[in-house]
């Protein structure tokens, strides 16, 4: 597709006469008809196969024709064609006199013709104008012409369609010969393939736009070169996707069971001793003078219960003060103003005089204590049971009820459930506060890894087109990592080719 352009420059008809020799009255109001057709060795009448165009009246007798519009017409004249330019042509230019305003052929007398020229030859597509001048006995016409391609058409014959685009079907501009020139960041025959971020992993990454790196399932990182561990994997790593290999001190399928909180987090402060008391659990044993779950707070004096004989402790700016009950006095309410005559001993305690009756002492029966036998013995107040054991008062004695995994008088001994290697098929054993847990290798499950659950899901080579197969251990299924150009759960479908273009 292209345009044959004809630029009329000057027409000379000094005598103002028609082709018949008769003069125009009052002068020759001149317009032109142009016929463009296929090459003929001898230009003859007949259909204008490449097109026709007429001008309005451009002048009288002799005149120069201005570029651009002139009296509603256009100069250069445009003769568009929508076929491959053959490289040869025939051109007929007729100058006519218009007695009135109607320029239609049927409205003009046959002798209104002023002059007629006919040329033929070869003409290549190009921007340069070919200048020509045709002279008859009475007239002279100077003009130039050329053939150029329409928008989006390129090549020697204007036969190559190329429309610049920047969309899903391509990202390019057109070179002068009609070939595609990809926009920055795009490649491929039709510039449809983005150039991914430099370094983006060839197999594990892809992109939908330039300088991007999108990761295929199981991979992450800026360049998609880091595997994604099993979903929920907390303190573990992977070397291929969906693995969860536990870091030291962590256990469980998701490596989320902290088997050594004390070492990992050092929660106890101010020199306290930390004891692991189960998964994600710990106990701090404070040094004297400190309190709080983590021994993080200094102890106020009243917290040590310094007041005796039922005295109440009040914190003061400079320490503490004991408010003593009736019958007692002293810094810690340790002195009594009572005697045995006042029957001060409770709960069947026996009273003994001291200092010639100025003082007394109570001898308490079992299970009671205090200077007046007023307190029931709670042998658990010192919390003697270690590792979360429960202290139970049993009359005059006490006993510790140990949590699973611990034994000894004070639950101080740790029983390792893993000592007897209970996990089958190479399972890894972890001691937990409530027993043990087995982390099973691929293909096995059950509390002791005794159940064979499946074989390797990738063993049957389910992925097509040289895709990489990964086994998801949690579901015993496979994931196919497709190479470029293939999609589908098994990489079985080739990516659709771009739609065909008309060249």
């Amino acid at each position: 597709s292209g345009v044959f352009q004809l630029q009329l420059q000057e027409f000379i008809n000094e005598r103002g006469v028609l082709a018949s020799g008769r003069p125009c009255e009052p002068g020759c109001r001149t317009f032109f008809r142009v016929c463009l057709k296929h090459f003929q060795a001898v230009v003859s009448p007949g259909p204008c196969t490449f097109g026709t165009v007429s001008t309005p009246v451009l002048g009288t007798n002799s005149f120069a024709v201005r570029d651009d519009s002139s009296g509603g017409g256009r100069n250069p004249l445009q003769l568009p064609f929508n076929f491959t330019w053959p490289g040869t042509f025939s051109l007929i230019i007729e100058a006519w006199h218009a007695p009135g305003d109607d320029l239609r052929p049927e409205a003009l007398p046959p002798d209104a013709l002023i002059s007629k020229i006919a040329i033929q030859g070869s003409l290549a597509v190009g921007q340069n104008w070919l200048l020509d001048e045709q002279t008859s006995t009475l007239t002279r016409l100077r003009y130039s012409y050329r053939v150029i391609c329409s928008d989006n058409y390129y090549g020697d014959n204007c036969s190559r369609l190329c429309k610049k685009r920047n969309d899903h079907f391509g990202h390019y501009v057109c070179q002068p010969d009609g070939n595609l020139s990809c926009l920055p960041g795009w490649t491929g025959e039709y510039c449809q393939q983005p150039i991914c971020l430099s370094g983006c992993h060839e197999q594990n990454g892809y992109c939908s736009k330039p300088a991007e790196c999108l990761c295929r399932p199981g991979w992450q990182g800026r360049l998609c070169n880091e595997c994604i561990p099993h979903n929920g994997c907390r303190h573990g790593t992977c070397s291929t996707p969906w693995q969860c290999t536990c870091d030291e001190g962590w256990g469980g399928l998701f490596c989320d069971q902290d088997l050594n909180y004390c070492t990992h987090h050092s929660p106890c402060k101010n020199g306290a001793t930390c004891s692991n008391s189960g998964q994600r659990s710990y106990t701090c044993t404070c040094r004297p003078g400190y309190t709080g779950v983590d021994c993080e707070l200094e102890l106020s004096e009243c917290d040590s219960n310094p007041c005796r004989n039922g005295g109440s402790c009040k914190d003061q700016e400079d320490g503490y003060h004991c408010l003593c009950p009736p019958g007692y006095y002293g810094l810690h309410c340790e002195h009594s103003t009572l005697s045995c005559a006042d029957s001060p001993c409770f709960n069947g305690g026996s009273c003994r005089e001291r200092n010639q009756g100025a003082n007394y002492a109570c001898e308490c029966p079992p299970n009671f204590t205090g200077s007046n036998c007023e307190k029931k013995v709670d042998r658990c107040t010192s919390n003697p049971c270690a590792n979360g054991g429960q202290c139970l008062n049993r009359g005059p004695s006490r006993m510790c009820r140990c949590r699973p995994g611990f034994t000894g008088t004070y639950c101080e001994l740790h029983v390792s459930d893993c000592a007897r290697n209970p996990c089958a098929h190479g399972g890894t054993c972890h001691d937990l506060e409530n027993g043990l847990m087995c982390t099973c290798p691929a293909g096995f499950s059950g509390r002791r890894c005794e159940v064979r659950t499946s074989i390797d899901a990738c063993a049957s080579s389910p992925c097509f087109n040289r895709a990489t197969c990964y086994t998801d251990l949690s579901t015993d299924t496979f994931v196919c990592n497709c190479p470029y150009g293939f999609v589908g759960s098994r990489c079985e479908f080739p990516v659709g080719l771009p739609p065909s273009f008309p060249w």
Epitope: G292, E298, S300
Partner: antibody, heavy 119, light 108 residues
Framework: EVQLVQSGPGLVKPSQTLSLTCTVS??????????WTWIRQHPGKGLEWIGY???????YYNPSLRSRVTISLDTSKNQFSLNMTSVTAADTAVYYC???????????WGQGTMVTVSS | AIRLTQSPDTLSLSPGERATLSCRAS???????LAWYQQKPGQAPRLLIY???SRATGIPDRFSGSGSGTDFTLTIRRLESADFAPYYC?????????FGQGTRLEIK
């Protein structure tokens, strides 16, 4: 961004139990060494620290309130709660939950709940 | 318990001026475990300073804390209208954790 949202009744009868809940959003209540704390402010007065709970469920209370206070944790709902028994008019206050990092400065607070003890 | 006494109870200043708030402890506070809070009406307190002198996240450098042992100071330079509110100090060195009674900063 971690936020604390409090819920619970604004009116409690004397001798009954005051119960408030603090829901943690934007983070896990079981993460790190945070002290999840309750603090109260009597009308027109200063602030009083009640106590705290850690992710492990271990608690520590203000000795003056220890006998009446229980703080508990519900990790499945990502929230912690305050129960205070045998309340009197002296327990009328705005109650706040707060988060303290490794030491007890309180960097994030709940919106506060005004609790009135009245029959 | 450690008693914290703040002074003055009320401080009247104009915007642009410098405010100096004091907090005195009944006993020495270990590790400078002292914090400052601002509390606007109807809102929860907001942490300004911890460790006596470290600014909390998002607090402008007009706020600064200093002091050690028993005497601590909060200084606010170039007061703005949003700064007028009650301020509390808090110790977290000894059990029980305690707060000062507060200083009310008001517009003169």
């Amino acid at each position: 961004e971690v936020q604390l949202v409090q819920s619970g009744p604004g009116l409690v009868k004397p001798s009954q139990t005051l119960s408030l809940t603090c829901t943690v959003s934007g983070g896990s209540i079981t993460s790190g060494g945070y002290y999840w704390t309750w603090i109260r402010q009597h009308p027109g007065k200063g602030l009083e620290w009640i106590g705290y709970i850690k992710f492990s469920g271990n608690t520590y209370y203000n000795p003056s309130l220890r006998s009446r206070v229980t703080i508990s944790l519900d990790t499945s709902k990502n929230q912690f709660s305050l129960n205070m028994t045998s309340v009197t008019a002296a327990d009328t206050a705005v109650y706040y939950c707060a988060r303290a990092p490794g030491s007890h400065n309180f960097d994030i607070w709940g919106q506060g709940t005004m609790v009135t003890v009245s029959s | 318990a450690i008693r914290l006494t703040q002074s003055p109870d009320t401080l009247s200043l104009s915007p642009g001026e410098r405010a100096t708030l004091s907090c005195r402890a009944s006993v020495s506070i270990s590790n400078n475990y002292l914090a400052w809070y601002q509390q606007k009406p109807g809102q929860a307190p907001r942490l300004l300073i911890y460790g006596a002198s470290s600014r909390a996240t998002g607090i402008p450098d007009r706020f600064s804390g200093s002091g050690s042992g028993t005497d601590f100071t909060l200084t606010i330079r170039r007061l703005e209208s949003a700064d007028f509110a009650p301020y509390y100090c808090q110790q977290y060195s000894r059990s029980p954790i305690t707060f000062g009674q507060g200083t009310r900063l008001e517009i003169k």
